[in-house]
C-alpha cells in the first residue's frame, strides 16, 4: 500500500452510550466544614485516584470523609468491591475505550491519554484542546482504571469488580453490601460548588448531589468548575436526572429520568474531553 492510500483512511466518529458513575461522594472535594476542630480524616482525591489525608473541622462537610485510610479505600478505590457486581460476563470496558484517539480540530498541544485497542494499553497523545471524543483522559492512571485490563488475566471493570478471564467467574474483592444507586448525570453534577478565583459576586446555582437539589451560590466570575448554572431551571435540566436504583438479580428500577438520550450522550462527551 502506498503512503497516499494509508493517508486517506479516515477515522469516523461513533455513537456512544452514557457513562455510568458510582458513589457520587467519592467525587466531592475534601470539605473541612465551618468548624475549627483539627481532626485527621481521609478523603478520595479524584485527580490522583487515591485516598489522602486532610484536616476536618468537626462539623458539616460532606460524605467524602473517612475515619481511616482503609475505610476510604474500601468505599472509593478500585481494590474495593463496594460496587455493583455485574451479572453479565462480557467484556466490561466502556465503548469509548475502543475509539481511535482524536486530537480534535483545535491545536493546543495538551498531553492526554487514550486507550489503544491494538496494543491494549493506555498511551499518551497530543490533544488539541477542543472537541475530540471520550477516549481522552487527563491522567494515565484514569485511563488505566477505566480502559485497561487488570493484572493476572483479570479484567477490571469500571466498578472495581474483577472478571477472571480464565474461568469467567466474578471475583469480588469484599463482602460488603454493594451501593444501591448509580448516578447517571454528567460528572460535574457530583462536584461541590466552586467560587473560583476572581472577586465578583455573581448569583449562580449548583447541583448538590447529597440532597439532590439545585442550590444558589456566589460565583467569583472566573475559574471554578462546570457545576455552575445561571438559573435553577438550567441546573435542574442538566443534573436532576435522578438516580437508578438497583434491586437484586441485577434488575433496575428507574426512579426519575427526564432528559432525552442524545442530550445525555453529549453531556458525557464533555466529561473527558473538557476537564482541563
Amino acid at each position: 500500500d502506498s503512503e497516499e492510500d494509508e493517508e486517506h483512511t479516515i477515522i469516523t466518529d461513533t455513537e456512544l452510550p452514557p457513562l455510568k458513575l458510582m458513589h457520587s461522594f467519592c467525587a466531592f472535594k475534601a470539605d473541612d466544614g465551618p468548624c475549627k476542630a483539627i481532626m485527621k480524616r481521609f478523603f478520595f482525591n479524584i485527580f490522583t485516584r487515591q485516598c489522602e489525608e486532610f484536616i476536618y473541622g468537626g462539623c458539616e462537610g460532606n460524605q467524602n470523609r473517612f475515619e481511616s485510610l482503609e475505610e476510604c479505600k474500601k468505599m472509593c478505590t478500585r481494590d474495593n468491591a463496594n460496587r455493583i457486581i455485574k451479572t453479565t460476563l462480557q467484556q466490561e470496558k466502556p465503548d469509548f475505550c475502543f475509539l481511535e484517539e482524536d486530537p480534535g480540530i483545535c491545536r493546543g498541544y495538551i498531553t492526554r491519554y487514550f486507550y489503544n485497542n491494538q496494543t491494549k494499553q493506555c498511551e499518551r497523545f497530543k490533544y488539541g484542546g477542543c472537541l475530540g471524543n471520550m477516549n481522552n483522559f487527563e491522567t494515565l492512571e484514569e485511563c488505566k482504571n477505566i480502559c485497561e485490563d487488570g493484572p493476572n488475566g483479570f479484567q477490571v471493570d469500571n466498578y472495581g469488580t474483577q472478571l477472571n478471564a480464565v474461568n469467567n467467574s466474578l471475583t469480588p474483592q469484599s463482602t460488603k453490601v454493594p451501593s444501591l444507586f448509580e448516578f447517571h448525570g454528567p460528572s460535574w453534577c457530583l462536584t461541590p460548588a466552586d467560587r473560583g478565583l476572581c472577586r465578583a459576586n455573581e448569583n449562580r446555582f449548583y447541583y448538590n448531589s447529597v440532597i439532590g437539589k439545585c442550590r444558589p451560590f456566589k460565583y467569583s466570575g472566573c475559574g471554578g468548575n462546570e457545576n455552575n448554572f445561571t438559573s435553577k431551571q438550567e441546573c435542574l435540566r442538566a443534573c436532576k436526572k435522578g438516580f437508578i436504583q438497583r434491586i437484586s438479580k441485577g434488575g433496575l428500577i428507574k426512579t426519575k429520568r427526564k432528559r432525552k438520550k442524545q442530550r445525555v450522550k453529549i453531556a458525557y462527551e464533555e466529561i473527558f474531553v473538557k476537564n482541563m
Epitope: 479516515i10 469516523t12 481511535e100 486530537p103 491545536r107 482541563m276
Partner: antibody, heavy 123, light 112 residues
Framework: QVQLQQSGPGLVKPSQTLSLTCAIS??????????WSWIRQSPGRGLEWLGI?????????RYAVSVKSRITINPDTSKNQFSLQLNSVTPEDTAVYYC?????????????WGQGTLVTVSS | DIVMTQSPLSLPVTPGEPASISCRSS???????????LNWYLQKPGQSPQLLIY???NRASGVPDRFSGSGSGTDFTLKISRVEAEDVGVYYC?????????FGQGTKVEIK
C-alpha cells in the same frame, strides 16, 4: 492569503447526489493546523454545519447527525482540494453551500470561506 | 445539540452610536485554559461570513477594535462601540463546545 474556490452544479434532481469541490490555495488540505468543513445556509435553517475533515497523524472526520447517513467529505491531496457528496437529496437540501477552513492554531474559528454555491434541488 | 439563541433578531442602528447583540447557549460553553468555545461572524450583504471574534473575546486579524466580545457560561455579548455604515449585515454566534457545531439564527444590523 488563503483562498477557497468552490465548484459544482447549481441544480440537482431529487434522489440524486449533490457533489461540490473546494479548491484550496495558500494552504494545504493536509495541514495539521487546519480543518476543512462544509456549511450550508438556507432561509429556513440559517447556517447549518454539515461536517469537517482534518489531518493530524491520520485523517479524521465528523458529520452532523442530520446528514450523517448521506454525507461524505473527502480530501484530495494531489489536487489540494476537498469535496462534499450528499446522497439522496430532497428539496429540503436546497441551500447556499459554503466550504470553510477552520483555523486550528491560535485562532480557533472558520477564518476563510468559499464564495458559496447556490444548489437547488428540483426536478 | 447545543441551541444558540440570539437577540434581537433585528437591530436598527445609528452610525456613531453603540450596538449590542446577545447570544445565549442552551448549555454552558466550557471555559478551558482561558478559552470560551464561542465565535462571532459577520455576513455582509451578498458575501460569505467572516470571522470577527474567536474564543469569546479575541478579535480576528483585520477586525477593527470597535468590535468586542464578552461573556462566559451561557451568556455572551458582541458590542460595537461606534457603529459605522460598513458594519451592516447579519451577525452570527457559533459554538464549538460539542458536536454538531451550531450557529445562532443571526441578528440583522441595519442603519436606521
Amino acid at each position: 492569503q488563503v483562498q477557497l474556490q468552490q465548484s459544482g452544479p447549481g441544480l440537482v434532481k431529487p434522489s440524486q447526489t449533490l457533489s461540490l469541490t473546494c479548491a484550496i490555495s495558500g494552504d494545504s488540505v493536509s495541514s495539521d493546523s487546519a480543518a476543512w468543513s462544509w456549511i450550508r445556509q438556507s432561509p429556513g435553517r440559517g447556517l447549518e454545519w454539515l461536517g469537517i475533515i482534518y489531518k493530524r497523524s491520520k485523517w479524521y472526520n465528523r458529520y452532523a447527525v442530520s446528514v450523517k447517513s448521506r454525507i461524505t467529505i473527502n480530501p484530495d491531496t494531489s489536487k489540494n482540494q476537498f469535496s462534499l457528496q450528499l446522497n439522496s437529496v430532497t428539496p429540503e437540501d436546497t441551500a447556499v453551500y459554503y466550504c470553510a477552513r477552520w483555523h486550528s492554531d491560535k485562532m480557533w474559528g472558520f477564518d476563510d470561506w468559499g464564495q458559496g454555491t447556490l444548489v437547488t434541488v428540483s426536478s | 445539540d447545543i441551541v444558540m439563541t440570539q437577540s434581537p433578531l433585528s437591530l436598527p442602528v445609528t452610525p456613531g452610536e453603540p450596538a449590542s447583540i446577545s447570544c445565549r447557549s442552551s448549555q454552558s460553553l466550557v471555559f478551558s485554559r482561558g478559552n470560551t468555545y464561542l465565535n462571532w461572524y459577520l455576513q455582509k450583504p451578498g458575501q460569505s461570513p467572516q470571522l470577527l471574534i474567536y474564543k469569546g473575546s479575541n478579535r480576528a486579524s483585520g477586525v477593527p477594535d470597535r468590535f468586542s466580545g464578552s461573556g462566559s457560561g451561557t451568556d455572551f455579548t458582541l458590542k460595537i462601540s461606534r457603529v459605522e455604515a460598513e458594519d451592516v449585515g447579519v451577525y452570527y454566534c457559533q459554538q464549538y463546545d460539542s458536536y454538531p457545531l451550531t450557529f445562532g439564527q443571526g441578528t440583522k444590523v441595519e442603519i436606521k
